[in-house]
């Protein structure tokens, strides 16, 4: 907290319930519980802010749409030059059509080549995917059993050799109070043994430890 005061100090005390005389009192009591913190913004202001936010969002969307239109226009203007027909006659227009047809043919050729490459890549991807599935099939997955595992065992399983070091460290730390608590541990251990025997955990535990 910036000012260092507690939440309780800042929270206003619940106002006493109004005297139940008029229906308006009941309405007020039902619609706005007095224990609730009163809003500092009026409903009309809230509406005004909401409208403003919506307006800003709308403007943003319109701007984005305009940007996209502009981008499209720019892209088209670089790819498709405007036809400059002033002063050109039938002969030139005929030749221009020839030029444009030649350009279209060239683009079509390029498109065909690209499509062929894409098709080849798709086929290769499909083949590789199939190989992955085939390889997966060759190795039989072991059936997994739910086992109860201690945090240390979990760490050892996950971290391997590095976990062993951290476990040793922990063991070293525990050694300090070991003598004092040995007696307690024994009692606790006996009690735990009884519970394990009752719940059938003893067998499972042995299985896991082996």
């Amino acid at each position: 907290m910036a000012d260092g005061s507690s939440d309780a100090a800042r929270e206003p005390r619940p106002a006493p319930a109004p005297i139940r005389r008029r229906s308006s009192n009941y309405r007020a009591y039902a619609t706005e519980p007095h224990a609730k913190k009163k809003s500092k913004i009026s409903a009309s202001r809230k509406l005004q802010l909401k409208t403003l936010l919506l307006q800003i969002a709308k403007q943003e969307l319109e701007r984005e749409a305009e940007e996209r239109r502009g981008e499209k226009g720019r892209a088209l203007s670089t790819r498709c030059q405007p036809l400059e027909l002033a002063g050109l006659g039938f002969a030139e227009l005929q030749d221009l059509c020839r030029q444009l047809h030649a350009r279209v043919d060239k683009v079509d050729e390029e498109r065909y080549d690209i499509e062929a490459k894409v098709t080849k890549n798709i086929t290769e991807i499909a083949d590789l995917t199939q190989k992955i599935f085939d390889l997966r099939g060759k190795f039989k997955r072991p059936t997994l059993r739910r086992v109860r595992i201690s945090a240390d065992a979990m760490m050892q399983a996950l971290l391997g050799a590095r976990a062993k070091e951290s476990l040793d460290l922990r063991a070293h730390l525990k050694q300090v109070k070991k003598e004092d608590t040995e007696k307690e541990n024994r009692e606790v251990g006996d009690w735990r043994k009884n519970i394990d025997a009752l719940s059938g955990m003893e067998g499972r535990k042995k299985k896991f430890e082996s």
Partner: antibody, heavy 121, light 107 residues
Framework: EVQMVESGGGLLKPGGSLKLSCAAS????????MSWVRQTPEKRLEWVAT????????YYPDSVKGRFTISRDNAKNTLYLQMLSLRSEDTAMYYC??????????????WGQGSSVTVSS | DIQMTQTSSSLSASLGDRVTISCRAS??????LNWYQQKPDGTIKLLIY???RIHSGVSSRFSGSGSGTDYSLTISNLEQEDIATYFC????????TFDTGTKLELK
């Protein structure tokens, strides 16, 4: 008054290169297609190149295609003809002309005075 | 390429004469034919476009006609300033081609 003034002509050896210029005035240059036409020493007129008003499209006869390049600078109201790998048969008076059209019929309505190009060894 | 040919390379006429210069195309050029005049000083001017349309500033003594492959330019009432070489040009197909020209001389 519509006017075209060619410059850049000269005498050069076969295989040489030259760039002709044509300064246009008296009309809205960027609204018109432009052409180069040459007249051989035998007085034959030969169309050499045409460029569209904005410079996007150009047209050439096979005799100069790949060797000559027509271009324009609409800001400077100037037309150019870059000539490479010149041959003796390119010797001619080179005219710059404004293009116009009427119902699909295109024509050269105004011509410059010409610029002489001589290719000789 | 479309070949353009004129019936004669030169013509002799007297002032005030009516002169007709012919031009033939190797194939139908659908009226896309223009006529140019080149003066002895080398200046070139457009006279007629699209077979029969007179270019602005050109005397009404000049007229054009024809269709398909055959076209002609007529000068009525020949004047001294008309002494020049006349070229026809087709605008139907690229490459644009001119004829060899007809040189008009005074008798």
């Amino acid at each position: 008054e519509v006017q075209m003034v060619e410059s850049g002509g000269g005498l050069l050896k076969p295989g040489g290169s030259l760039k002709l210029s044509c300064a246009a005035s008296g009309f809205t240059y960027s609204n018109y297609a432009m052409s180069w036409v040459r007249q051989t020493p035998e007085k034959r007129l030969e169309w050499v190149a045409t460029i569209s008003s904005g410079g996007s499209y150009s047209y050439y006869p096979d005799s100069v295609k790949g060797r000559f390049t027509i271009s324009r600078d609409n800001a400077k109201n100037t037309l150019y003809l870059q000539m490479l790998s010149l041959r003796s048969e390119d010797t001619a008076m080179y005219y710059c002309a404004r293009r116009d059209n009427y119902y699909g019929s295109s024509f050269m309505d105004y011509w410059g005075q010409g610029s002489s190009v001589t290719v000789s060894s | 390429d479309i070949q353009m040919t004129q019936t004669s390379s030169s013509l002799s006429a007297s002032l005030g004469d009516r002169v007709t210069i012919s031009c033939r195309a190797s194939q139908d050029i659908t009226n896309y034919l223009n006529w140019y005049q080149q003066k002895p000083d080398g200046t070139i001017k457009l006279l007629i476009y699209y077979t029969s349309r007179i270019h602005s500033g050109v005397s009404s003594r000049f007229s054009g006609s024809g269709s398909g492959t055959d076209y002609s330019l007529t000068i009525s009432n020949l004047e001294q300033e008309d002494i020049a070489t006349y070229f026809c040009q087709q605008g139907n197909t690229i490459p644009l081609t001119f004829d060899t020209g007809t040189k008009l001389e005074l008798k």
